[in-house]
Interface confidence: low
Amino acid sequence: EVEKTACPSGKKAREIDESLIFYKKWELEACVDAALLATQMDRVNAIPFTYEQLDVLKHKLDELYPQGYPESVIQHLGYLFLKMSPEDIRKWNVTSLETLKALLEVNKGHEMSPQVATLIDRFVKGRGQLDKDTLDTLTAFYPGYLCSLSPEELSSVPPSSIWAVRPQDLDTCDPRQLDVLYPKARLAFQNMNGSEYFVKIQSFLGGAPTEDLKALSQQNVSMDLATFMKLRTDAVLPLTVAEVQKLLGPHVEGLKAEERHRPVRDWILRQRQDDLDTLGLGLQGGIPNGYLVLDLSMQEALS
């Protein structure tokens, strides 16, 4: 705690400027008026204060705004934001996207800190949903942001926001998250023509059901192996050899390199060996010719 001491004669700050970097901590505490600081926050960033000096300035703002800083101050916090704790940020009411951008800029290039996570949480909750502009901003700063959300949180993403999502934003999403995002993407891109639709929907296909994959196989899309390997195993298993051949187009040859990995491995086990042989890839492990194939899932549904 900085002790309360009187400001030495002639040292009272009339404005926030570079002369303050020569002030000792106790002089900053005594000589800088909190209200002046609040109105001139935009100048703080341009002055090379030490971390200790920034602590003093934060303390002054905390005293002035015990219930939380107003947005006019928050927007100009700059590097002082790095001094904030998640508890401090929970008191804020941030509604402007410009404010959010300004604070994310301060943390740019670093991992998402607890402070940033709290800030984003406050901002999104304040808006009520993850709209397109917010999503655009967040994924620009943190490509993995979308995949850090729970399926429940993702359910508040409106389909219109899906247009802001880039393929790299989905790199770390797991199947549960893609299950939520895929129907939204399908809705968002529904009016696009075949090839354009496939380019946009491709990143979301890890959440696609079998019937949609069957439909895609009729559209000459040439899905690459990387995308195929990310499909849900349960969605791939019912596909026939002919459907997989049509779905992958020229990439069907790549199945050989992936034959020991899911979902290819599990899919092979479900196919008749003579059907697999038609691909000419030497895929082994299919159901031997002459064996009867029982669909147990269908049997369970009937009983």
């Epitope: 690459d224 790549g254 038609t278 691909l279 000419g280």
Partner: antibody, heavy 116, light 110 residues
Framework: EVQLLESGGGLVQPGGSLRLSCAAS????????MSWVRQAPGKGLEWVSS????????YYADSVKGRFTISRDNSKNTLYLQMNSLRAEDMAVYYC?????????WGQGTLVTVSS | QSVLTQPPSASGPPGQRVTISCTGS????????VSWYQQLPGTAPKLLIY???HRPSGVPDRFSGSKSGTSASLAIGGLRSEDEADYYC???????????FGGGTKLTVL
């Protein structure tokens, strides 16, 4: 042993046509995609066209689209390339190759000369 | 102008290791497997490497392939005079819906 033997090359005038054939042996022809790749004198390799095992899908380089047609006769183990409206820039050695993403076997090639 | 970029030439003395690069984009090398082909003077090309780094039977282990992002490379260790040839990389391109080759690299054993 896998063998691919191209034939049908020769001298043709600009605007003329030729039909190349590739006789395959040593593997189950009907199970594999097949391709044509060409090489102009002193130049690099250029993919021309590919066809699925059952002929259901065909792919062409932009430079030959609308002029060349790839086809196959699985009962004869033969791949074809029908070349129409030939141009000077089509002059090359044409190779027949097995597969479509990895050309694991190649024929010795047949020379197509386009000149007036 | 080839879609895949290779250096036009490479060289090294016998016994040395030489590397040939192949640079593409996300629509070809970035998303698809790379193959390397060797063409000895006056002969048809021969497959050297497939699926980025696999060697067909009969290809010496002096030849190795690797890929990172949108670039691939072919390394030849213990150079021999019989390695003098043109080397081509190739990959399917999703945007063009076509197979693309590099312009080729002429390897000279000094």
């Amino acid at each position: 042993e896998v063998q691919l033997l191209e034939s049908g090359g020769g001298l043709v005038q600009p605007g003329g046509s030729l039909r190349l054939s590739c006789a395959a042996s040593g593997f189950t022809f009907s199970n594999y995609a097949m391709s044509w790749v060409r090489q102009a004198p002193g130049k690099g390799l250029e993919w021309v066209s590919s066809i699925y095992p059952n002929g259901s899908s065909k792919y062409y380089a932009d430079s030959v689209k609308g002029r060349f047609t790839i086809s196959r006769d699985n009962s004869k183990n033969t791949l074809y390339l029908q070349m129409n409206s030939l141009r000077a820039e089509d002059m090359a050695v044409y190779y027949c190759a097995k597969n479509l993403l990895t050309f694991d076997y190649w024929g010795q090639g047949t020379l197509v000369t386009v000149s007036s | 102008q080839s879609v895949l970029t290779q250096p036009p030439s490479a060289s090294g003395p016998p016994g040395q290791r030489v590397t040939i690069s192949c640079t593409g984009s996300s629509s070809n090398i970035g998303n698809n497997s790379v193959s390397w082909y060797q063409q000895l003077p006056g002969t048809a090309p021969k497959l050297l490497i497939y699926y980025d780094s696999h060697r067909p039977s009969g290809v010496p282990d002096r030849f190795s392939g690797s890929k990172s992002g949108t670039s691939a490379s072919l390394a030849i260790g213990g150079l021999r005079s019989e390695d003098e040839a043109d080397y081509y990389c190739g990959a399917w391109d999703d945007s063009l819906n076509a197979y693309v080759f590099g312009g080729g690299t002429k390897l000279t054993v000094l």
